[in-house]
Amino acid sequence: WPPPGTGDVVVQAPTQVPGFLGDSVTLPCYLQVPNMEVTHVSQLTWARHGESGSMAVFHQTQGPSYSESKRLEFVAARLGAELRNASLRMFGLRVEDEGNYTCLFVTFPQGSRSVDIWLRVLAKPQNTAEVQKVQLTGEPVPMARCVSTGGRPPAQITWHSDLGGMPNTSQVPGFLSGTVTVTSLWILVPSSQVDGKNVTCKVEHESFEKPQLLTVNLTVYYPPEVSISGYDNNWYLGQNEATLTCDARSNPEPTGYNWSTTMGPLPPFAVAQGAQLLIRPVDKPINTTLICNVTNALGARQAELTVQVKEGPPSEHSGISRN
């Protein structure tokens, strides 16, 4: 604005005004008159750039006239009152309403004063994120999907993760004319380590006060990964019973555990209890390879463990699991 004291009347308005598709919006426009300055406003005019004629006129004596009377309204101008506020309300915003508008005051004796306002027509998108459940493929596949539906302008989608991964983003026209639906896929080579981890889809849009964060919990289907725990190489004759555990990670969950040995069925001193194997005390040395076979919907995997029960004083050793 000009510095105080220059005496000129000035039209004040924002350079840009946002409005939402289908909603109403007010284009603010005011005449700033310095103290002591006399001015007389005879007419307010709104025109759209590139179009001939005026879309809205408020005349001191004739009042308002509109190119589309059902969609336009001077919010403050009244007959018989000083015309200082030319603010115009637009109803039922359409995509084609986006553009540059000129607000003009006809003042005397200062002359016509105008300002340009850019009306931005926005549509607030709806955002969803979902997991893409995958199996171990050995190659990159979409593992998460984030969709921002019906935005204007198109939303910006980014992914945040410690796992790496690559985005693949595309857009198509939305249901409402002028809107855009943005789809972003998060792509990675599936592995069991990724299963259950989170990635975050960040959606940014002019209509949001802050970015929207949507968390996706990744799902990788994989056959069991099996190991046997509970043996520390220090088992001796005469010790109490010990327990071995068949540790299995899988998705979906294991459906069955089967214990055996390389020689066939379990020996009498070994008792299967689901994922656990109870080893009873023995009175002679043993050297046996135990097998745990775990099954889930995707298959079966097994782990082997060679167990030795040696002669020696149990009191000197502490590696065995006791009940």
Epitope: M36, H40, S42, Q60, F108, P109, G111
Partner: antibody, heavy 121, light 109 residues
């Protein structure tokens, strides 16, 4: 054709009042700003007041507040100026002028021929 | 009230460029004074030439132009013609009233 037709010369006595008229044609009167100016013989111009014909809104030179009163009659597209408590100092030619717009600014566009007022006892 | 001062008389020759100025007693003339220029020819024939400092009225020859030069308003006639011989008044706006200058008698010899 745009015209401002002013009333004829007036010879008036000190202390009296006079009402000058300015009949317009050829333009939209109700959207017009009309100023009244004073010119003493061989001297410069002095602005008295303006009026917006559409509403009758006025603005006066402080010097003439209480001395001059400007009005309009939209039905006849005529502007008036009444001068009261006349003295010999008020002897002058009085012009009505329609302001025209260049878009960005206003100018003194259409001038009446002037009305000579002589104040004499 | 402010006093507006103009050259009392100027002489120029046909085809020459002449500049008339308009000074304000209150300080520099600015665009917020909306300087007007009016031409008076014999028999009180008035023509508005310029409004709002530099806006030429419709129908006024392009040789007439308004501007601000230094702290004054100016009317420049580029290529004066004999018919430009007249008295030229400037008028300045002071927030709520116009003040006219004393006029410049321009002679084109």
């Amino acid at each position: 054709q745009v015209q401002m037709q002013q009333s004829g010369a007036e010879l008036v006595k000190p202390g009296a009042s006079v009402k000058l008229s300015c009949k317009t044609s050829g333009f939209t009167f109700s959207s017009s700003y009309i100023s009244w100016l004073k010119q003493k013989p061989g001297q410069s111009l002095e602005w008295i007041a303006w009026i917006y014909a559409g509403t009758g809104d006025t603005n006066y030179n402080q010097k003439f507040t209480g001395k001059a009163q400007v009005t309009v009659d939209t039905s006849s597209s005529t502007a008036y100026m009444q001068f009261s408590s006349l003295t010999t100092e008020d002897s002058a030619i009085y012009y009505c002028v329609r302001h025209g717009s260049t878009g960005r600014g206003w100018y003194f566009a259409v001038w009446g021929a002037g009305t000579t007022v002589t104040v004499s006892s | 009230q402010a006093v507006v001062t103009q050259e009392s008389a100027l002489t120029t020759s046909p085809g020459e460029t002449v500049t008339l100025t308009c000074r304000s007693s209150t300080g520099a003339v600015t665009t917020s004074n909306y300087a007007n220029w009016v031409q008076e020819k014999p028999d009180h024939l008035f023509t508005g030439l310029i409004g709002g400092t530099n806006n030429r009225a419709p129908g006024v020859p392009a040789r007439f132009s308004g501007s601000l030069i230094g702290d004054k308003a100016a009317l420049t006639i580029t290529g004066a013609q004999t018919e430009d011989e007249a008295i030229y008044f400037c008028a300045l706006w002071y927030s709520n009233h116009f003040v006219f200058g004393g006029g410049t008698k321009l002679t084109v010899l």
